[in-house]
């Protein structure tokens, strides 16, 4: 498909042209952010970013890869390196102790230098490191922390718990020994390291004792309660603030968003992680988008400003699973709720990153035509006469022998939400890839970010434009509009 | 391993703040560039880049990742959109026209608008598009490409031709009908087309007639000319200029690099494309570094500055043929040719630009340990309890069944420089990939280099930052030492 | 021009050793792949081993019948190639043959060879 | 390992005959294969690489052909001095030879 308009040079050059004037227009902003928000796509390399940009391209009815992002529109672009200090292909926790709190750690650690061990609890004490949302609470703004997945998940546990393992998300998970050694599960960390005003996503399950039934799957034992220290974690959270209020469901997160009552928010829609955005039961459960504006909503009440951490956490689900439809589908929701936020804050005064913590081995390949699904086949048959997908997997489930022979596949198999992409090696789980991440940034000293940078940089680089900890004599005007 | 200074906190705390100072004394320049060059890493996308950075650091006994690439010190970052008019997966023709001419075209055409057609000479007229490098040419500087790949290739003819089919090479390739209709191959444009003064690279069997013995392979038939209309194209070359030189080995390029009498150089090393560094005769061939050297010493006596294009042209062969290792060595020199070259030049006058044309299906996951070979093996086995390597492709000849099955691989295998890693699906050639490519930038109007931008921003900015057409209007102050 | 020239070759008794050596000129020894083979008599030609140049760090390849017991390696200074063949048995009886690959259409063709020299184990 | 199966062993034919030499790969060898000629106390020579390209010197008679798993060399025009024994050798993966055909004259 050849778009008439595209075939005429003036069609490019006026197109460029115009680029280049909005490019000679950026204006570095000296002012401090009084707002800081970093949306994290889990799993989102940029292999993902373009073919989700081509899908929500074609879901408008584009032929999409012309079409923007949300996060393509951010006018500052780095390259992150998301190695871990112990591995060349880093997991969620190594690199969410890096983006959150600027220091690299080891391998499937959260919260933690590198001189702790992955499940030596006696490695904890001392090798904390403290997450720019910590210090921004310390600095009297309001935090929140919004999640597809269940909030005790790496990624945003890196902005509030220490844990030299990241499986820890209730004490049921804990060894007794560990306990013992003083160690705490994920969950309690939640409610007991730092006053956290909005907390967002999945994950009621490891707040409450074994036995309690859920309130959505009440007949359901395995979705219920699994603590075995008997704690009511949500309750003792509410008894800590007087305005404090704890839902479960879309409807009563809605409600209390709207609630000038309400000062701090629990919303917990699942036992576990949040459901898929294409099986969300959008009566029970919100979106990523309706729970970043919730949020948003009740922080942007502090004169002092915010932090906010949103994770499309479910992109790297998707890919693990080598079900490419669910991953990019989360991409979609992730962007949309970037959107969202753009339209419910000002660049003046709100510092806003995109980032992934790490990639996936997930490409997108094989010449389609323009304008072809995302999904479907590349043009030509390979090696061995059948059909092959444009998105395929290094590694994964997807890998297939039939009859001691790669299976075909046609373009109604390969568009199926269920389908997994073939794969060179079989894995249970496909894995992480090592290759740098984009990071986009808009608003306050965005400008900052440039170049090719250690993951690290992300953390220091919200904190400096806040003027937190380590950067409180930061030497930023005051930023545009503040009340303080 | 982890290396011990890396478990303080402190480490990577003071890393970032020298980041971020750095990144707060950035200036853009308001000056012009008085030199552009533009590096083109065939087929380096993201993995690319980062899996070379981790050989590279390597081969310096370092545990990888931690190290800069030349490329990774330059300060501004972009991501570049790739496709074709016509496919979501571009080839090097269609990305040439984009990043050389300013304007997309269609798959496998080069410096033509989208509305020539692949192969149907009849589309050619009227839709040719001009390069930066033609333009730069006509406001009085001197012009140069280099290539590992034949000069008559996709990508540097970019700079200077017009083909509905990028393998006319020579006159041999374009069907007689085409050839009759006045359809030039691109061997013939590459010396009539305009004024180039510096041409390095493989590529001289297109410029002989058929039964001209080879000066390297005189015995060998296959590698000597191929051209059917009786022309010896270099013999028409050097006639049109007074000091123009014709080299084919390394010692006489090194010889005329430094002789003043020479103003027009061209030096083709191999009958058709470069061999990969790692099989170069290093006293026949010179490497991609010594040839930028020698074009760089050339074109810089040109007061009013230079315009060069450099390719490490056979990043992409490696790949095509799933092997690695030969893709990522070919990174490395391309990567030693942009240091040189930053040797060589001031940033001050020089504004230099880092991209691919597009990326390839190629990954580098399954958690290695950091230090570990990135030719290496997996921790662990695959689901069919045989090993399997951390670099993968998601299609291409590395694919194999044996005996019905995935075949076992150990690392001494894999790290082979012949060593094809495994593919999901079997094809000849492994293909292209769609996602976005970085584009790295330093210099003059560096800072324009931002966001996610079209491919064509890149050929648009490079004029503007010299005022060059259409941007003669560009309003900079004049570069920094013009002598012009 | 490029030339190869087996030398070292002889009788010698099961069990024992002898080194080959393969001397080249003509052209940059270092930027080569170099190869042993052999044929023994009446059966058809084997490749032995592989030694790299120096772009790829002289690694070292060997077939299934010859690993652990013959080691190739190279002496760039003078441009030798060597075959150690150690615990020699009667089937190694064959003609060894060295060889310089170059890279046509990026693979590794075997464009020169050495005459042979004869290597006969026997008691 | 990969392993070439060369077909026939030996072969008789007559001045003037068309020859074919088969060698079948047991995988992919993406035309990674030469021919060559070997006579009793010489060094084999190479006649064809790259499934098709011919050696200097080597007469136009000798052709190359295949893909994948499967190769041909064909003497167009069988002569006497074409007596030999020819090897097929595929280099995608170190080196493997065939095992040899054995050409001789009716």
């Known amino acids: 498909i050849i778009p008439v308009e595209e075939e005429n040079p003036d069609f490019w050059n006026r197109q460029a042209a115009e680029a280049l004037g909005a490019a000679k227009k950026l204006q570095p902003a000296q002012t401090a952010a009084k707002n800081l928000i970093i949306f994290l796509g889990d799993g989102m390399g940029v292999s993902t970013v373009t073919a989700a940009r081509i899908l929500k391209g074609q879901k408008k009815d584009k032929l999409g890869p012309e079409t923007f992002l949300a996060m393509d529109r951010f006018p500052y672009v780095a390259l992150s390196k998301t190695y871990s200090v112990d591995k060349h292909v880093p997991d969620s926790g190594a690199t969410a102790t890096a983006y959150l709190c600027g220091v690299k750690g080891n391998f499937q650690t959260i919260g933690l230098s590198a001189a702790a061990r992955f499940n030596q609890c006696n490695t904890t004490r001392g090798n904390e490191v403290i997450s720019v949302m910590n210090r921004a609470k310390k600095a009297g703004k309001s935090v929140g922390v919004v999640t597809t997945t269940r909030v005790q998940h790496a990624s945003p546990a890196g902005a509030y718990a220490h844990t030299v393992n990241r499986n820890w998300y209730s004490d049921a998970d804990v060894p007794a020994s560990a306990r013992q050694e003083g160690c705490q599960d994920i969950a309690t960390q939640l409610i007991s390291n730092m006053d956290i005003d909005v907390i967002l996503g999945g994950g009621r399950k490891y707040m409450f004792p074994m036995g309690t039934p859920d309130p959505e799957y009440p007949d359901d034992y395995s979705q219920g309660g699994t603590r075995l220290d008997g704690k009511n974690l949500v309750q003792e959270w509410l008894a800590k603030h007087q305005g404090a209020r704890y839902v479960w469901n879309r409807t009563e997160l809605l409600q209390a968003s709207l609630d000038p009552s309400v000062t701090h928010l629990m919303g917990l829609f699942e036992p576990g992680d949040m459901k898929y955005e294409i099986h969300r039961d959008s009566t029970l459960d919100p979106s990523l988008m309706e729970m970043t504006e919730a949020a948003l909503l009740l922080l942007s009440r502090n004169p002092r400003g915010f932090f906010l951490f949103v994770e499309g956490g479910r992109i790297d689900h998707g890919h693990h699973e080598s079900r490419a439809y669910r991953a990019l589908t989360e991409t979609i929701m992730f962007d949309d709720a970037i959107e969202r936020a753009g339209q419910l804050t000002s660049e003046e005064d709100t510092l806003s990153l995109v980032t992934a913590d790490h990639s996936h081995v997930f490409s997108f390949g094989g010449y389609p035509l323009r304008g072809s699904s995302i999904f479907g086949l590349a043009p030509g048959k390979a090696r061995d006469r059948k059909a092959y997908t444009v998105l395929l997997y290094g590694n994964g489930p997807g890998y297939v022998l039939k009859d001691g022979a790669r299976p075909d596949v046609t373009e109604s198999e390969s568009g199926s939400p269920e389908y997994r992409q073939q794969s060179a090696v079989p894995l249970d789980g496909e894995t992480h890839a090592g290759e740098d991440v984009a990071v986009f940034a808009r608003g306050p000293q965005a400008h900052l970010v440039h170049g090719v940078q250690e993951q690290t940089f992300i953390a220091h680089v919200m904190a400096f434009a806040a003027c937190l900890e380590p950067y409180t004599a930061c030497d930023l005007a005051p930023r545009a509009g503040t009340t303080d | 391993i982890i290396p011990v200074e890396e478990e303080n906190p402190d480490f990577w705390n003071r890393q970032a703040a020298e980041a971020l100072g750095a990144a707060k004394k950035l200036q853009p320049a308001q000056t012009a560039a008085k030199n552009l060059i533009i590096f083109l890493g065939d087929g380096m996308g993201v993995s690319t880049v980062t899996a070379a950075r981790i050989l590279k650091g390597q081969k310096k006994d370092k545990l990888g990742p931690e190290t800069f690439l030349a490329m990774d010190r330059f300060p501004y970052v972009a991501l570049s959109k790739t496709y074709s008019v016509d496919k979501h997966v571009p080839d090097s023709g269609a990305t040439a026209t984009a990043y050389l001419c300013g304007v997309k075209g269609n798959f496998q055409t080069i410096g033509l608008s989208a509305a020539a057609r692949f192969n149907q000479c009849n589309t050619t007229r009227g839709n040719e598009v001009i390069s930066v490098m033609n333009r730069a040419k006509k406001a009085g500087k001197s012009v140069g490409v280099v290539t590992t790949t034949r000069v008559q290739h996709a990508s540097p003819a970019g700079a200077y031709a017009h083909t509905v089919n990028r393998n006319w090479y020579s006159d041999a390739d374009v069907p007689a009908s085409a050839r009759q209709e006045g359809c030039q191959d691109i061997a013939t444009q590459l010396i009539s087309n305009m004024d180039i003064d510096v041409i390095l690279g493989g590529g001289r069997k297109y410029m002989f007639p058929m039964g001209t013995p080879d000066p390297e392979y005189p015995d060998d038939y296959s590698q000597g000319g191929t051209r059917l209309d009786g022309k010896n194209l270099v013999q028409e070359w050097l006639a049109k200029h007074q000091g123009a030189r014709y080299v084919w080995n390394r010692t006489e390029l090194l010889q005329a690099s430094l002789d003043p009498s020479v103003t027009h150089l061209m030096g083709l090393f191999e009958p058709g494309d470069m061999k990969y560094e790692i099989h170069r005769d290093s006293t026949l061939d010179p490497s991609l570094m010594e040839m930028t050297e020698a074009a760089l010493l050339l074109l810089s006596r040109n007061p009013r500055g230079f315009f060069l294009f450099v390719e490490g042209g056979r990043i992409d062969h490696g790949h095509h043929e799933s092997r690695a290792y030969r893709a990522l060595t070919e990174t490395i020199m391309f990567d030693d040719a942009i240091e040189r070259a930053g040797q060589l030049t001031s940033e001050e006058d020089t504004l230099s630009l880092v991209t691919a044309d597009h990326s390839h299906v190629f990954s580098f996951g399954g958690y290695p340990l950091r230090g570990s070979s990135i030719f290496g093996l997996a921790p662990g086995k695959a689901r069919d309890r045989k090993a399997y390597t951390v670099l993968l492709y998601g299609n291409g000849p590395g694919y194999v069944l044996k005996d019905g099955a995935r075949p076992d691989v150990t690392e001494s295998e894999s790290g082979s420089p012949e060593y094809r890693q495994q593919s999901a699906v079997p094809l000849d050639g492994e293909t292209h990939a769609g996602e976005d490519v970085a584009v790295f930038a330093r210099g003059p109007q560096a800072h324009l280099v931002h966001g996610v931008q079209e491919q064509t921003f890149i050929a648009h900015v490079m004029a503007f930052a010299a005022c060059l057409e259409p941007y003669t209007a560009c309003d900079l102050a004049p570069r920094a030492g013009t002598t012009d | 021009e490029v030339q190869l020239v087996e030398s070292g070759g002889g009788l010698v008794q099961p069990g024992r050793s002898l080194r080959l050596s393969c001397t080249a000129s003509g052209f940059t020894f270092t930027d080569y792949y170099m190869s042993w083979f052999r044929q023994a008599p009446g059966k058809g030609l084997e490749w032995l081993a592989l030694i790299r140049n120096k772009a790829t760090g002289y690694t070292t390849e060997y077939s299934a019948s010859v690993k652990g017991r013959f080691t190739i390696s190279r002496d760039n200074s003078k441009s030798i190639l060597y075959l150690q063949m150690n615990s020699l048995k009667t089937e190694d009886t064959a003609v060894y043959y060295c060889?310089?690959?170059?890279?046509?259409?990026?693979?590794?063709?075997?464009?020169?060879w050495g005459q042979g020299t004869l290597v006969t184990v026997s008691s | 390992d990969t392993q070439m199966t060369q077909s026939p062993s030996s072969l008789s034919a007559s001045v003037g005959d068309r020859v074919t030499i088969t060698c079948k790969a047991s995988?992919?060898?993406?035309?990674?294969i030469a021919w060559f000629q070997y006579k009793t106390g010489k060094a084999p020579k190479l006649f064809i690489h790259?499934?098709?390209t011919l050696q200097p010197g080597v007469p136009s008679r000798f052709s190359g052909s295949g893909s994948g798993r499967d190769y041909t060399l064909t003497i167009s025009s069988l002569q006497p001095e074409d007596i030999a024994t020819y090897y097929c050798?595929?280099?995608?993966?170190?080196?493997?030879f065939g095992q040899g055909t054995k050409l001789e004259i009716k």
């Open positions: 995988q992919d060898i993406n035309k990674y």
């Open positions: 060889a310089r690959a170059s890279f046509y259409y990026d693979g590794k063709v075997l464009a020169y």
């Open positions: 790259y499934t098709s």
């Open positions: 050798l595929q280099y995608d993966n170190l080196y493997t």
